[in-house]
Interface confidence: low
């Protein structure tokens, strides 16, 4: 019994003396934030030199303050206990932890590429000044129809599927244009596809014929050897849009 009582008292004394013992063993633990434990001065707590800080106590060196230069600007000045914080100058935005990089802003409807800001390709959009162009939502995957067409700056707006637009159903969207009875959407789609295909073939053969007459058989062979190219929207300049798969952003302007 007496033995266990002695153990409890001993433990209590150890706990109570821990902090004092620790500071006797390591005088540096007494140095508060804003100072460092200076070994050159017999481990006295010296204030951090200018342009440096220590955010925690007991540090053996102060850390040199971050300098917000170039494309970075100072959001918060460095103090003896906290580092400076940077953000980016107008026309740039922060990237990375603690704004470690600044990346150029683009306009809505554009994305940043290695060659600068480029318009989003047809079928993609970007509604922010940063980030990449994303594909429009495919409404048909959800069995819905396109209510508002997409642009470079905005995604498409999907509406209820045509089947949902029965006379009894209440909807905030305007009713779809009336169709001739007996013509289902599938039949209309089929005829549209057929007409488009026929037109494409006609266009193709006209081009071939023109090429043969104009440039001879050699040119015709060249056309057939070319890999299939994705058609570019005629409304945009040849190199005006950025057609690429989403990839890691380039780290711009890291100082």
């Amino acid at each position: 019994m007496g033995n266990s009582c002695y153990n409890i008292v001993a433990t209590l004394l150890l706990v109570l003396n821990f902090e004092r013992t620790r500071s006797l063993q390591d005088p540096c633990s007494n140095c508060p934030a804003g100072t460092f434990c200076d070994n050159n001065r017999n481990q006295i707590c010296s204030p951090c030199p200018p342009n440096s800080f220590s955010s925690a106590g007991g540090q053996r060196t102060c850390d040199i303050c971050r300098q917000c230069k170039g494309v970075f600007r100072t959001r918060k000045e460095c103090s003896s206990t906290s580092n400076a914080e940077c953000d980016c100058t107008p026309g740039f935005h922060c990237l990375g932890a603690g704004c470690s990089m600044c990346e150029q802003d683009c306009k809505q409807g554009q994305e940043l590429t290695k060659k600068g800001c480029k318009d989003c390709c047809f079928g993609t959009f970007n509604d922010q000044k940063r980030g990449i162009c994303r594909p429009w939502t495919n409404c048909s995957l959800d069995g819905k129809s396109v209510l508002v067409n997409g642009t470079k700056e905005r995604d498409v707006v999907c509406g209820p599927s045509p089947a949902d637009l029965s006379p009894g159903a209440s909807s905030v969207t305007p009713p779809a244009p009336a169709r001739e009875p007996g013509h289902s959407p599938q039949i209309i789609s089929f005829f549209l596809a057929l007409t488009s295909t026929a037109l494409l073939f006609l266009l193709f053969f006209l081009t071939l014929r023109f090429s043969v007459v104009k440039r001879g058989r050699k040119k015709l062979l060249y056309i057939f050897k070319q890999p299939f190219m994705r058609p570019v929207q005629t409304t945009q300049e040849e190199d005006g849009c950025s057609c690429r798969f989403p990839e890691e952003e380039e780290g711009g302007c890291e100082l």
């Epitope: 010296s46 030199p49 200018p50 342009n51 850390d63």
Partner: antibody
Framework: QVQLVQSGADVKKPGASVKVSCKAS????????MHWVRQAPGQGLEWMGI????????SYAQKFQGRVTMTRDTSTSTVYMELSSLRSEDTAVYYC???????WGWGQGTLVTVSS | QSVLTQPASVSGYPGQSITISCIGS?????????VSWYQHHPDRPPKLIIY???NRPSGVSDRFSGSKSGNTASLTISGLQAEDEADYYC??????????FGTGTKVTVL
């Protein structure tokens, strides 16, 4: 005892870069700042910059901003000073020196000669 | 001000006292507790002889003493000896977080 041992003399052409090393021993490497100071022939001491080996943070003299890079390798207790776009006026003895507000221990110095 | 101003040379006879001044500004010498002095013999690295304005590292002779008044720091060498012949540099931390040396003073023992 505390020792700072620097790399040997180097000759460089104008426009080139030089990287001088400074290996520390005899103390806790991460507990002391390291400064770089140079002295051109017939000139005084010139402070170039400082590195905190603990975190690797740096501060450079305005004159050398954009041309100097100070790094450290804690595994070998070595600090490095790289100076780029060398000019003839960069011919000097380059010292590493340990300390905070003052420089307690110095390396033996490294003579860098810039000549075409 | 890119450097601290020191007299180019100071001389004295053995046993005499000499004082070297180091003129700075309110953003370096006047601002900082970190004012130090170095002795530099040719072909040797500099040696710290005074730190924190007036403190001497162990092993440095008590003939060397430092002081500061406003933006000017001073180093006094008393009982001048032949081995004191060297270049002397003051230095200070700056409010900008950089470090600056003086122009240097050549001490000649006559």
């Amino acid at each position: 005892q505390v020792q700072l041992v620097q790399s040997g003399a180097d000759v460089k052409k104008p426009g080139a870069s030089v990287k001088v090393s400074c290996k520390a021993s005899g103390y806790t490497f991460t507990s002391y700042y390291m400064h770089w100071v140079r002295q051109a022939p017939g000139q005084g001491l010139e402070w170039m910059g400082i590195i905190n080996p603990s975190g690797g943070s740096t501060s450079y003299a305005q004159k050398f901003q954009g041309r100097v890079t100070m790094t450290r390798d804690t595994s070998t207790s070595t600090v490095y000073m790289e100076l780029s776009s060398l000019r003839s006026e960069d011919t000097a003895v380059y010292y590493c020196a340990r300390g905070v507000g003052e420089l307690w221990g110095w390396g033996q110095g490294t003579l860098v000669t810039v000549s075409s | 001000q890119s450097v601290l101003t020191q007299p180019a040379s100071v001389s004295g006879y053995p046993g005499q006292s000499i004082t070297i001044s180091c003129i700075g500004s309110s953003s370096d010498v006047g601002f900082s507790q970190y004012v130090s002095w170095y002795q530099h013999h040719p072909d040797r690295p500099p040696k710290l002889i005074i730190y924190d304005v007036s403190n001497r590292p162990s092993g440095v002779s008590d003939r060397f003493s430092g002081s500061k008044s406003g933006n000017t720091a001073s180093l006094t060498i008393s009982g001048l000896q032949a081995e004191d012949e060297a270049d002397y540099y003051c230095s200070s931390y700056r409010s900008s977080g950089t470090y600056v040396f003086g122009t240097g003073t050549k001490v000649t023992v006559l």
